[in-house]
Interface confidence: low
């Protein structure tokens, strides 16, 4: 505890100039007061000043009113400072002295001599309101107050708590009268360390540093911090929890950046061709006649088609296209033919049938050869009929298509899905992506396919020291502290700035 | 109820003495509770502490006036008083007497009306 | 000689919180009162000894000292509280007055 008893002098009188022994002060008697206050006796002894003792300078001369100074020499009221807790009951002697000397500091005179004393014994309450007293003796009269009131920062029916009001990160707050705290505005907790943060601020997911703040913790974002912050790269994707990356309806992958319509979202075929969409990112353009390129970007010629038969040759004209027949052929595609089967016109042995009285004829061509003089080799692959981008290939009497991935049939016309065998157990959801199914597991479960049932939450025993946040699916170890600032370690268990003999460093 | 009154004349020379007495009813000057003190106040302007006494005698002046100032006091009487030499137009103001209260920290509780003097010849 | 300084005007609305500052040197070592003065009569004391109201004041004075400032507040002022207000305080053996402040 610590307070201060107050002994305000207010008037002494000594009308005669008398000391006590009897004898008169010459020219009058200086007068200057020695205070002595001590604990409780019922009869008042010498001894100690337990509760301290202080001396005046001189006062005044005789008879004298005491005039209030708050500083300096002769302070006024008079100030017992103690440092312990107020026992509501005290002694008091009061003692004027006659001073032949120094003015200031009359105790180091020699020769002073007693003029009169008082002793005040009994109880008195801390408190602000002055006991008033007057005591008068045969030769001299003393008026005087006195109260006790506790030292700043103390509080208290005795002075003995101490409570000093603050600013700082330690604390935010006022001192009550009775020395409770009284927190300022904005913040709480026992002693107003802690900050109210912003209203509607998420409690888990938010904290502060100062009033009305609302600082957001790794994963989260917004305002409030109620809203996740998904995979770093997460193009077109949602969360519901920090990290995470669904993927919004036409999108795939683990960043949901492939693009799983992408005949509709970029319409990439040209010229009114059909688009088929085949995986992330794949498609297919199947071209009007006339047009030609992955796109259908490319126009045709018009002889493209070959349309010049029996070995004609095609030339392109504005719009349209002609024919120039070789010898013993005519019409618009070198269709008819001036020869008969004896001038041999078939080809790669092929057998000559006469036709109208021998007039023209038809040649019967052997396999793999065709056209009207069996002139052709036969390709079956020039009519693409490979769907999905899959090549064409000549094997002997016949021809395969080699399909790309995710495609099969014999013209690569059937998509082949890598999620149609659920590859992902415990409920998890597939994805086809270019290099292979990925499933998003479900609580509880992780793995390449969620075949690894998780046993436990690798957070639920707070792995992670000095208020590091956890996180769980992220490592092989299944959990992830994120660590605060000044700390490193797995569990965040170091504070940076160990000093060098310290075994571990980050 | 202490009352306090100013009294003395309205008007002074430069150079003359200004002198006022202030007469306490109602309560004794004989009390080492008070000082008895003098305040005055230009006209338009603000308050300006000049000195106070005890009932014993004892006298305490502004710094400013200390040459010029005396206060005195009469317990037969239950009077104070002022005076003030060498006055100028300067010193035209509003004279309060004022009872200055030791449990108050000196703070003045009871105050008479005042009295204006002018300084003009 | 010590100085005691003080706004010389404040404007507050009925009801509203009034705070008038009187600055000195180490002034929170001093008693500090102040006086209420209206137009053409003595002043009143309404704070004495820092904070402290004499009777028959009412409760809406209060005072504060600390450091170098002394502050008066009237809350919930009155029409009644327009008047001049005089900070005072002891330096050494003499009494100092504020500059005053008119309370509007």
């Known amino acids: 505890g610590s307070g201060i008893f107050q002994l305000r002098l207010q008037e002494f009188v000594n009308q005669r100039g008398m000391l006590a022994n009897g004898q008169s002060c010459e020219p009058g008697c200086r007068t200057f007061f020695r205070i002595c206050l001590k604990h409780f006796q019922a009869t008042f002894s010498e001894g100690p000043c337990t509760f301290g003792n202080v001396s005046t300078p001189v006062l005044g001369t005789n008879s004298f009113v005491v005039r209030d100074k708050n500083s300096g020499s002769g302070r006024n009221p008079l100030q017992l400072p103690f440092n312990f807790t107020w026992p509501g009951t005290f002694s008091l002697n009061i003692q004027a002295w006659h001073t032949p000397g120094d003015d200031l500091r009359p105790e180091t005179s020699p020769g002073n001599s007693l003029i009169s004393q008082i002793i005040i014994q009994g109880s008195l309450a801390v408190g602000k309101i002055w006991r008033t007293d007057e005591q008068n003796d045969t030769l001299t009269r003393l008026s005087y107050s006195y109260r006790v009131i506790c030292s700043d920062n103390y509080y208290g029916e005795s002075c003995s708590r101490l409570c000093k009001k603050r600013d700082d990160h330690f604390g935010h707050y006022e001192c009550q009268p009775d020395g409770s705290l009284s927190c300022l505005p904005g913040w709480t907790g026992k002693y107003c360390d802690q900050p109210i943060c912003l209203s509607g601020c998420h409690e888990q997911n938010g904290y502060c540093s100062k009033p009305d703040e609302c600082i957001c913790r790794p994963g989260w974002q917004g305002r409030l911090c109620n809203e996740c912050i998904p995979h770093n790269g997460c193009r077109h994707g949602t969360c519901s929890i920090p990290w995470q990356c669904a993927c919004d309806e036409g999108w795939g992958g683990l960043f949901c950046d492939q693009d799983l319509n992408y005949c509709t979202h970029h319409s990439p075929c040209k010229n009114g061709s059909t688009c088929s969409n085949s995986g992330p990112k794949g498609y297919t353009c199947t071209c009007l006649p006339g047009y030609t390129g992955e796109h259908c970007e490319l126009g045709l010629s018009k002889c493209a088609s070959n349309p010049c038969r029996n070995g004609g040759s095609c030339k392109d004209q504005e719009n349209s296209y002609h024919c120039l027949c070789p010898p013993g052929y005519y019409g618009q595609h070198c269709e008819h033919s001036t020869l008969t089967c004896a001038d041999s016109p078939c080809f790669n042995g092929g057998s000559c049938r006469e036709r109208n009285q021998g007039s023209s004829y038809a040649c019967e061509c052997p396999p793999n050869f065709t056209g009207s003089n069996c002139e052709k080799k036969v390709d079956r692959c020039t009519s693409n009929p490979c769907a999905n981008g899959g090549q064409c290939q000549n094997r002997g009497p016949s021809r395969t298509c080699r399909c790309r991935p995710g495609f099969t049939g014999t013209h690569c016309e059937l998509h082949i899905s890598d999620c149609a065998r659920s590859p992902c157990a415990h409920g998890g959801t597939c994805h086809d992506l270019e290099n292979g199914p990925v499933c998003t597991c479900p609580a509880g479960f992780s793995g390449r396919r969620c075949e690894v049932r998780i046993t436990h939450d690798a957070c639920a025993s707070g792995p992670c020291f000095n208020g590091a946040t956890c996180y769980t699916g992220l490592s092989p170890n299944n959990f992830v502290c994120n660590c605060p600032y000044g700390f490193v370690g797995s569990r965040c268990e170091f504070p940076v700035g160990l000093p060098p003999s310290f075994p571990w460093v980050a | 109820e202490v009352q306090l009154q100013e009294s003395g004349p309205g008007l002074v020379k430069p150079s003359e003495t200004l002198s006022l007495t202030c007469t306490v009813s109602g309560g004794s000057i004989n009390s080492g509770n008070y000082y008895w003190g003098w305040i005055r106040q230009p006209p338009g302007k603000g308050l300006e502490w000049i000195g106070d006494?005890?009932?014993?005698?004892?006298?305490y002046y502004n710094p400013s006036l200390k040459s010029r100032v005396t206060i005195s006091v009469d317990t037969s009487k239950n009077q104070f008083s002022l005076k003030l030499s060498s006055v100028t137009a300067a010193d035209t103001a509003v004279y309060y007497c004022a009872r200055e209260d030791v449990m108050y920290g000196g703070g003045g509780d009871s105050w008479g009306q005042g009295t204006l003097v002018t300084v003009s010849s | 000689s010590y100085e005691l300084t003080q706004p010389p005007s404040v404007s507050v609305s009925p009801g509203q919180t009034a705070s008038i500052t009187c600055s000195g040197e180490g002034l929170g070592d001093k008693y500090v009162s102040w006086y209420q003065q209206k137009p053409g009569q003595s002043p009143v004391l309404v704070i004495y000894?820092?904070?402290e109201r004499p009777s028959g004041i009412p409760e809406r004075f209060s005072g504060s000292n600390s450091g170098d400032t002394a502050t008066l507040t009237i809350s919930g002022t009155q029409a009644m509280d327009e008047a001049d207000y005089y900070c005072q305080a002891w330096d050494s053996e003499a009494g100092v007055f504020g500059s005053g402040t008119k309370v509007t």
């Open positions: 000894e820092d904070s």
């Open positions: 006494i005890s009932y014993t005698g004892s006298t």
